[in-house]
């Protein structure tokens, strides 16, 4: 497949000719609620704009210059101005504002809780498998295998801190060297970025929102992948991370500190522990080759236990098997020794839903996975709705200006670094990069934060999660302190190195350009987002894992040609866009390749066939189901609740003809009603001033 889908002719400006990059509609006044009807990602500039079939008049515009789809939408205020309200109206508006704030915080709370439950669900479904990945002996000699294990395990348990703590305990137990642990940590860094990508999928209903949200989420992915692409070979060649961190650990006489403050967990734990509680030690035990752990359930049953250490006499085959010479004797027939036995007495059961069900881990995990995704999606929709209604007019202007404006010259360059610090600080407060980046995703989607600003915030989040790990390491018991601290520092310096590679010079901010490219493609072919997720977080790591198990020869035999082809394509792509004249005429574009290798259109047709049943009748019982429906059928109307795509053919016929931009309507309320957003009466009670 060509590096950029549907590239007939190589152009100097790839952004304008990527799939879905061009042809964006002029920005709607109420962009916070724009629907697919106002967004045709494929239409060329010269196409005539037609009104939808329900319009009574045809208003034709002259072909206009198409707006950059990455420009933030105008969050127009359609409500009555504060000054025009009477006292009753002002009081009502004030309480509406308070109500919205409470609702926003409530949904935000359940959003974070659902992320926690999602992590637990993933651990129940794939935790034991994840533990078994670690018990593979080839990790020690194969850094690439270590990397993909880090990715797979973190994706499976939805928590980089879980996979990192397994690595720490393995290093402390000498089952793993720090050198072998570094690629796993790099992989964990990649794996943790899947969470906000999943969150971005929830915003699939609105193309423009989805474009921004998905790009905003995947900027994290691309940063991590690119950092690994450069830094893993560097680390394998020089071991710079291992050496630097070893010097730091050896030069300081660390005393055990206190645990990292659990700020967000304090609020969310009371709720999440009522849903499910996990015994995370089981995954670590499996990773350490503990056979008994394989039959243990991850679902915690007993929360209060009494542990009593006693010594018991046990028989041994010979005196050589004694625990110590002084504790060895015979009764004249058998040899005996004294063994320390920890006797665990169960006192009180845990108080969570699944405590008495005795369901297998897979069943509990599947139930929680579905429920947490539904809650996550529902909360996200509600957060976006509330933010959409709150962030209008003056409020939006202030927030957007505050977040996205740079410092005055000559200090503009400092803004990004402040954003990195803010990202690190916020992540430190919430104790999870997944939570922070996932909360950021809908804000990018609705246009409050630009991707350019989200990028340093995400980088800061990567740093924040490592500082939490350093604090946690300092609180480790003596035997684990050194190894956990060194691994936490490796994680820290890896992220610092990544930032130095992909942030200081604007030209090197490749993750932004790549994420925007992917956002454009995914906005047009929404199924590609799921495809990307599966390919990058499951298939590629699993393929590398499989090839690594087959041995170095197989891995090199398959890997080298693949890498060679990728490099060749990238070089060709670069030459096509920079100096096409150097190339023979045939190679100046991708037309020499069959269509399926250079465009997603044929693939789209295949996907459409598979999801045909959804396409013909795209009915949804609720907005949550809508999201899944939208992903599958790419239906332009499917996110109008309880509506069906009965006139899908009609919609498909007019696909190349963009809808008239809503600002041509005299009344914005009519425009919004026509778009199926709110009933006509709704605007009268709209209140935005808090």
């Amino acid at each position: 497949m060509a590096p950029w889908p549907e590239l007939g002719d190589a152009q100097p400006n790839p952004d304008k000719y990527l799939e879905g990059a061009a042809g964006q509609q002029p920005t709607a006044p109420d962009k916070s609620k724009e629907t697919n009807k106002t967004d045709n990602t494929e239409a060329p500039v010269t196409k005539i704009e037609l009104l939808p079939s329900y319009s009574t008049a045809t208003l034709i515009d002259e072909p206009t210059e198409v707006d950059d789809p990455w420009n933030l939408p105008t969050l127009q205020d359609s409500g009555i101005k504060w000054s025009e309200r009477d006292t009753k109206g002002k009081i009502l508006c004030f309480f509406q504002g308070i109500g919205r704030l409470i609702l926003l915080l409530g949904f935000l709370y359940f959003f974070v809780c659902s992320l926690d439950i999602l992590s637990s669900a993933f651990q129940l479904v794939g935790g034991k498998m994840a533990g078994q990945f670690f018990s593979n002996s080839s990790i020690m000699s194969n850094p690439l295998l270590g990397l993909v294990i880090g990715v797979l395990v973190t994706v499976l348990v939805q928590s980089s801190s879980t996979s990192t703590s397994i690595v720490v305990s393995m290093v402390s137990s000498s089952l793993l060297t720090v050198r072998a642990a570094i690629p796993i940590i790099m992989g964990a860094n990649i794996g943790t970025s899947i969470t906000n990508t999943i969150v971005a999928l929830m915003q699939v209903g609105d193309r423009s929102e989805f474009r921004r949200a998905f790009a905003g989420a995947t900027v994290h992915d691309f940063f991590n992948w690119l950092s690994v692409l450069v830094l893993l070979p560097v680390e394998v060649a020089t071991h710079y991370l291992e050496i630097i961190t070893q010097l730091i650990v050896e030069s300081f006489h660390f005393k055990n500190g206190e645990d990292a403050p659990d700020l967000l967990k304090v609020i969310t734990k009371p709720f999440t522990k009522l849903i499910v509680q996990l015994d995370k030690k089981v995954i670590s035990q499996i990773a350490m080759n503990d056979e008994k752990a394989k039959n243990k359930s991850l679902v915690k049953i007993w929360c209060k236990t009494f542990t009593n250490k006693t010594q018991i006499n046990v028989t041994v085959p010979s005196t050589a098997n004694c625990t110590s010479p002084s504790l060895c004797w015979t009764d004249g027939i058998q040899n005996w020794t004294m063994k320390n036995v920890t006797y665990k007495e169960n006192i009180a059961k845990c108080q969570h839903i699944f405590v008495n069900f005795h369901l297998p881990d897979l069943a509990v995990g599947t139930i929680l996975l579905i429920l947490s995704l539904l809650v996550l999606c529902g909360c996200l929709i509600m957060i976006v709705k509330i933010l959409g209604s709150v962030l209008k007019g003056q409020v939006a202007t202030v927030i957007k200006k505050t977040i996205n404006t740079d410092f005055p010259f000559p200090f503009a360059w400092l803004t990004g670094y402040l954003a990195i610090l803010v990202g690190a600080g916020m992540t430190f407060i919430v104790q999870s990069s997944s939570v922070f980046t996932s909360a950021l995703t809908p804000l990018i989607g609705i246009g409050v934060i630009t991707i350019e600003r989200a990028y340093p915030l995400t980088l800061g989040s990567n740093i924040g999660t490592t500082t939490t790990a350093i604090l946690a390491a300092l609180a480790s018991p003596g035997n684990a302190l050194r190894s956990s601290l060194q691994i936490a520092l490796c994680h820290f310096f890896f992220n610092i190195s990544g930032i130095l590679l992909w942030y200081p010079i604007p030209f090197t901010r490749l993750p932004i350009r790549m994420a925007k490219g992917l956002g454009n493609i995914s906005a047009k072919y929404r199924w590609f987002a799921v495809f990307y997720l599966i390919i990058f977080f499951f298939l590629i790591p699993l393929t590398v894992f499989g090839l690594s198990l087959a041995g170095w020869r197989v891995l090199v035999g398959v890997g080298v040609p693949v890498v060679f082809i990728i490099i060749l394509v990238l070089c060709l792509r670069l030459l096509q866009s920079r100096c096409p004249r150097v190339l023979p005429k045939k190679l100046q574009n991708w037309n020499f390749l069959p269509l399926w290798m250079r465009s997603l259109k044929p693939w789209d047709a295949v996907v459409s066939k598979f999801t045909g049943c959804f396409q013909m009748r795209c009915c949804c019982c609720c907005r949550v189901c809508c999201r899944a429906c939208c992903l599958l059928c790419d239906c332009p109307k499917c996110c109008r609740c309880s509506k069906c795509c009965e006139d899908l053919e009609e919609a498909q016929e007019g696909q190349d003809v963009p809808v008239k931009a809503p600002e041509t309507f005299d009344n914005i309320t009519i425009s919004r009603e026509a778009q199926g957003e709110v009933p006509a009466s709704d605007s009268k009670t709209e209140c935005t001033a808090l």
Epitope: T319, L327, T330, D331, I333
Partner: antibody, heavy 119, light 107 residues
Amino acid sequence: QVQLQQSGAELVRPGASVKMSCKASGYTFASYNMHWVKKTPRQGLEWIGAIYPGNGNTSYNQKFKGKATLTVDKSSSTAYMQLSSLTSEDSAVYFCVRGGRGLGTMDYWGQGTSVTVSS
Amino acid sequence: DIVMTQSHKFMSTSVGDRVSITCKASQDVGSSVAWYQQKPGQSPKLLIYWASTRHTGVPDRFTGSGSGTDFTLTISNVQSEDLADYFCQHYRNIPLTFGAGTKLELK
């Protein structure tokens, strides 16, 4: 109370065999090892071997392997030791001793059986 | 085999005195040592096991000590009924072996 009643003194000819008994009472016979100890003025106390009546497992001092055979009859709570190919070296007092539970100690001793090998 | 050596064949004492009988193992036996008392015309009796633990019914004037290779049986305030042969025995491994014995007699 624990009692171990051994059979009476034996006078045997060289090359012959002798089987002595030890009847246990006052405890659960099958739960404790039964040791046999030889006492001579010259060698002092020597451990011959032990048997666990619960399953009939035995253990012998290498020096007495082939010389002594330990058996039990659980129904009568009696332990037996047979000595074969007797020589004057085998003349001694033989004690049956109840072992400590899980220990190689010898809690309760029988009164001893005197064996004299003489032609 | 582990050899248990009781260096004194005889030890003289007076009633009310304190006497220590020693026993040395040819190799480390930990604490797996027992002490026995045999009065003339009687069967031996267990006094001490685990080098220092008194058996039931044994008077507290009998105390055992030591670990590894050197062990001691101490009788404080010797009584006339304590005049007997004393044997040490290890139960570290098979075969169990006894010391040659120490005869305690009146001065």
